[in-house]
């Protein structure tokens, strides 16, 4: 969380951003909030990116003002217009690109003052893994697949019964480049699994950490997966 305070002029206002990550090819949100004003006409929101000459986005007098917008963001940005009046300056970024990573500034002017805060935005690819029993294999085998990751992640297997065990000798992980030549499909196979045990396939890079769990008993198979973004720090 980054909290910035205004400088000079009327009194300063508090602006708060949260470091976040964007999943390339999907829509992302750069989060920014500020002390609300009661009238829309005096609120100005400017998003800037370090190293970029033009603006990322500008909203003033109740409208988008995009005449100074940088070419790389053309047609890809929007504020949540109905939420501006309650202090939400967050920016929706469409079709996140790898090159969108960097330091952004959320700069706010209201009738009460000015303020700004920086935000670190990481970009990459992350997806939920799915763990299945591989019935084609000769021994009891689990297969963990996740369709899109970047940068290349690490894959670690764990088991509820054999806690702390190292499965690197009995697992094999491969990375297959997807058609757009950036993201990769992650496939990890775990051999010699035992019944009545819960196994976890953990995939992690510097942006996200995802886990796929599978519990195999004689009567049923239970699956669960979750994904967590790393380094969501407020500022």
């Amino acid at each position: 969380l980054i909290i910035g305070f205004g400088i000079s002029g009327r009194h300063s206002i508090t602006v708060t951003t949260v470091a976040s990550a964007g999943n390339i090819g999907e829509d992302g949100i750069l989060s920014c909030t500020f002390e609300p004003d009661i009238k829309l006409s005096d609120i100005v929101i400017q998003w800037l990116k370090e190293g970029v000459l033009g603006l990322v986005h500008e909203f003033k007098e109740g409208k988008d003002e995009l005449s100074e917008q940088d070419e790389m963001f053309r047609g890809r940005t929007a504020v949540f217009a109905d939420q501006v009046i309650v202090g939400n300056a967050s920016l929706r970024l469409k079709n996140v690109q790898l090159t969108d990573a960097g330091t952004y500034k959320c700069y706010i002017i209201t009738s009460k003052g000015k303020g700004n805060a920086n935000l670190e935005y990481k970009t990459g690819a992350f997806s939920m893994p799915e763990v299945n029993v591989d019935y084609n294999a000769s021994s009891e085998t689990l297969r963990c697949e996740a369709p899109r990751w970047f940068p290349q992640p690490t894959v670690v297997w764990a088991s509820q019964v054999d806690q702390g065990a190292n499965f690197s000798e009995v697992s094999n992980t491969s990375f297959e480049l997807n058609s757009e030549n950036v993201t990769m499909k992650v496939v990890s196979v775990l051999y010699n699994v035992t019944i009545n045990n819960t196994y976890s396939c953990m995939i992690e890079n510097d942006i996200a950490k995802a886990t796929g769990d599978i519990k195999v008993t004689e009567s049923e198979i239970k699956r669960r997966s979750h994904l967590q973004l790393l380094n969501s720090k407020a500022s």
Partner: antibody
């Protein structure tokens, strides 16, 4: 859930003052503007003023400057509006209302102030 | 100050009919308009914020549209509980101002 509970009805003599309270709960009182709105009998709605309890910033409708004074006590999450030099035209229902997720999304139940000799 | 003019002042309709309420601002207010419903003895209730965003729990027969100076609240098919007074309000500039209200009454 968000609630705004106002003080009870008041009957006052011309020239007197009255202080209406509005106790907020269910949200962070210091983070959102609190407004006061007047509705005279059979009439429409009229914005009086607003206060931002986080730093006590206020914004008044010029028409009500000198008539209304608004304050907020953050320790009790209560906003107040004092009306001075009361006249018959101040007879009205006064509402407190806040803007949490949308403009004027929560309202108090209203306080009837009657000015009569 | 920005003047909000509502029309008509009264709308006499039967349940099931469509109601169209209009609100005109004396200057451009972008999308900064909200609509409220008020019944006798009650506080106003928010229906539509920022010209077209239906507030949580508001039935989808209520819809708002417009930007700039001309705004509309539409009730697609009136239910008995919809007969009330409706106000528009701008939050583009201070003083915040309301329209004079439109009373929707049973024909």
């Amino acid at each position: 859930q968000v609630q705004l509970v106002q003080s009870g009805a008041e009957v006052k003599k011309p020239g007197a003052s009255v202080k209406v309270s509005c106790k907020a709960s269910g949200y962070t009182f210091t983070s959102y503007w609190m407004h006061w709105v007047k509705q005279a009998p059979g009439q429409g709605l009229e914005w009086i003023a607003a206060i931002y309890p986080g730093n006590s910033d206020t914004d008044y409708n010029q028409k009500f400057k000198g008539k209304a004074k608004i304050t907020a006590v953050t320790s009790t999450s209560t906003a107040y509006m004092e009306l001075s030099s009361l006249r018959s035209e101040d007879t009205a229902v006064y509402y407190c209302t806040t803007t949490v997720a949308h403009y004027f999304d929560y309202w108090g139940q209203g306080t009837m102030v009657t000015v009569s000799s | 100050e920005i003047v909000m003019t509502q029309s008509p002042a009264t709308l006499s309709l039967s349940p099931g009919e469509r109601a169209t309420l209009t609100c005109k601002a004396s200057q451009d207010v972008s999308f900064a308009v909200a609509w409220y419903q008020q019944k006798p003895g009650q506080a106003p209730k928010l229906l539509i914020s920022s010209a077209s965003y239906r507030y949580t729990g508001v039935p989808d027969r209520f819809s708002g549209s417009g930007s700039g100076t001309d705004f509309t609240l539409t009730i697609s098919s009136l239910e008995p509980e919809d007969f009330a007074v409706y106000y528009c309000q701008q939050h583009y500039n201070t003083p915040l101002t309301f329209g004079g209200g439109t009373k929707v009454e049973i024909k």
